[in-house]
Amino acid sequence: KFSKQSWGLENEALIVRCPRQGKPSYTVDWYYSQTNKSIPTQERNRVFASGQLLKFLPAAVADSGIYTCIVRSPTFNRTGYANVTIYKKQSDCNVPDYLMYSTVSGSEKNSKIYCPTIDLYNWTAPLEWFKNCQALQGSRYRAHKSFLVIDNVMTEDAGDYTCKFIHNENGANYSVTATRSFTVKDEQGFSLFPVIGAPAQNEIKEVEIGKNANLTCSACFGKGTQFLAAVLWQLNGTKITDFGEPRIQQEEGQNQSFSNGLACLDMVLRIADVKEEDLLLQYDCLALNLHGLRRHTVRLSRKNPIDHHS
C-alpha cells in the first residue's frame, strides 16, 4: 500500500519521494532494504537522503532495489517503500514501455502534456521537449512552465513526448529526462456555454430528517472531448472539501456520459443523516468550462413522513 515504483536512466538525476507523508519537522530515515544499510544524509555522497526525498546524483544501474523510508512521528514510525529501477541508456530512439509514464490524451482545440515528476527537482525554465527523439520546433509548440502546449492538435501529433531539464544541486547540474505517450481523440467536437440539466434553478428538494439524501448536478458542455469542463457542488459558496461537514460528500470522480452525442458530466452530492441545520444551507450546482460558469441553486425543505392510520 505504501509502496511506490520509481525509475530512471543511468547517469541522470533521480529523486524519489517517500510514499509516507509527514510534517516537515519529522525525521525521515532511509535504508537500502536488502542490506538494511542506512542511506547517508551528507550531500557529498552520490546517493543521499534529504528528508522526504532520496536523491541519486547521478543514478547508476547498481542502485536498483527497494529502499525503505521511515517517517518518525511523535507516536509511530511510519514505513514506506520505494522500488527503484535504474536502466541503461538506449542507443536507439525507442523508449521502452518500462520507462514510460502515464499516457495523456488531448483533443484538437489544444492540449497540455505535463513533464512527469518535475516537481521533485530544482530546475529552471525552459524545458526542452522532444517527440520521437526530434526536438520540437514551430509556433504550435509552446513550452510553458512544467508542461508543453500543442495548439490545433492533429492525429499526427500522437506519439511519445520526452521532456528534458537540468536539476541543480549545490551548483552541480544533472540531466533528467522523462517520457510519456500522448494520444489524440479524433472527434469533430464543439464547446458550448454549460447547460445544467439538473437541478432546476431554485429547486426545492424535499428531504426527511435523519434519512440520507442525494442531489445530482448534471450539465452538458458541447460535443466530443471537452478541454476543460467540470461540475461541482458548493455549500454556502464554499467548496465541499473546505466546508468540512463529513456527512456531506461529493461522489468521487465525475461520471461522463454522452447524451445525444453531447458531452455531459454529473456529480452526486450525498448527505448522510440529514439534520435540521442542513435545511438552512444553500446548495449550488456549478458547471464551468472555457465559456464560463453557470450556477443553479437548490434548497432543502423538510418532508414530513406520511402518517399511517389504520
Partner: antibody, heavy 121, light 106 residues
C-alpha cells in the same frame, strides 16, 4: 462518511478490567491510526495511546503503560482499548479518535460518541 | 512531558466581542491544534497546525503562534460559541492537552 461508533456505558468494580470497542466505517480501516482519549467528569482531555490497525503497533502515554492494552480486528474494522486494575479515578468518558490526514497528524478530526466507564465499589 | 497551560481558565464575554485564549507550552512545539467541546458532546477540531481552519469551521475562528506561545481567537463571539476550548500539542509523546478554557456569555 467517516463514522466511529463505540460500545455502551460500563460500570466496573475497583480492580476489574474494562474493554471498550470502537467500530470504524466510511474509510479504509487500515489506513488510519486510532487514538484513545479520556475525560474524567468535569476535567480536561487526556491522551492514553494509539494503535496502527495495519500492523497492530501501539504507542502509549507512559502513565497508562502496563495497564492499557490496545488491539484491533481488521475483519470487523474494530479497535479495542482494555484498561485493567481499575480505580475510582479511572471513571471517565473514553473516546476513540482519528486524524483527518493520518500521516500529517493534523488533529483529531473524527471522534467516537464516547463510552462512559464508571468505577465504583 | 510537555505541559500545556491555557489562560484564562474561564472567561465571560458578550456577543460580538473579540475573544482570545492563550496556550503556553513548557517546551517548544511545532504545531498546535484547538478543539471546541460542548457539554455531553465529543470535542470538535476547529484549528489544526496552529492556524489552519478545519473543514466547515466558520472563519471567525483563527489561531496563531509558534514555539511555546500560541493564541486562539474568536473575532466576533456568537451565542453558539459557548463551550470549553482546548489546545493540544502533537510534537512529542505523550500528546498533551491544555486544561481547557470555559467560555460563557455575559
Amino acid at each position: 462518511q467517516v463514522q466511529l461508533v463505540q460500545s455502551g456505558a460500563e460500570v466496573k468494580k475497583p480492580g476489574a478490567s474494562v474493554k471498550v470497542s470502537c467500530k470504524a466505517s466510511g474509510y479504509t480501516f487500515t489506513d488510519s491510526e486510532m487514538y484513545w482519549v479520556r475525560q474524567a467528569p468535569g476535567q480536561g482531555l487526556e491522551w492514553m495511546g494509539a494503535i496502527d490497525p495495519e500492523t497492530g503497533d501501539t504507542a502509549f502515554n507512559q502513565k497508562f503503560k502496563g495497564r492499557v492494552t490496545m488491539t484491533r480486528d481488521t475483519s470487523t474494522s474494530t479497535v479495542y482499548m482494555e484498561l485493567s486494575s481499575l480505580r475510582s479515578e479511572d471513571t471517565a468518558v473514553y473516546y476513540c479518535a482519528r486524524a483527518f490526514d493520518n500521516d500529517n497528524d493534523d488533529g483529531f478530526a473524527y471522534w467516537g460518541q464516547g463510552t462512559m466507564v464508571t468505577v465504583s465499589s | 512531558d510537555i505541559q500545556m497551560t491555557q489562560s484564562p481558565s474561564s472567561l465571560s464575554a458578550s456577543v460580538g466581542d473579540r475573544v482570545t485564549i492563550t496556550c503556553s507550552a513548557s517546551s517548544s512545539v511545532n504545531y498546535m491544534h484547538w478543539y471546541q467541546q460542548k457539554p455531553g458532546k465529543a470535542p470538535k477540531l476547529l484549528i489544526y497546525d496552529t492556524s489552519k481552519l478545519a473543514s466547515g469551521v466558520p472563519s471567525r475562528f483563527s489561531g496563531s503562534g509558534s514555539g511555546t506561545d500560541f493564541t486562539f481567537t474568536i473575532s466576533s463571539l456568537q451565542p453558539e460559541d459557548i463551550a470549553t476550548y482546548y489546545c493540544q500539542q502533537w510534537s512529542s509523546n505523550p500528546l498533551t492537552f491544555g486544561q481547557g478554557t470555559k467560555l460563557e456569555i455575559k
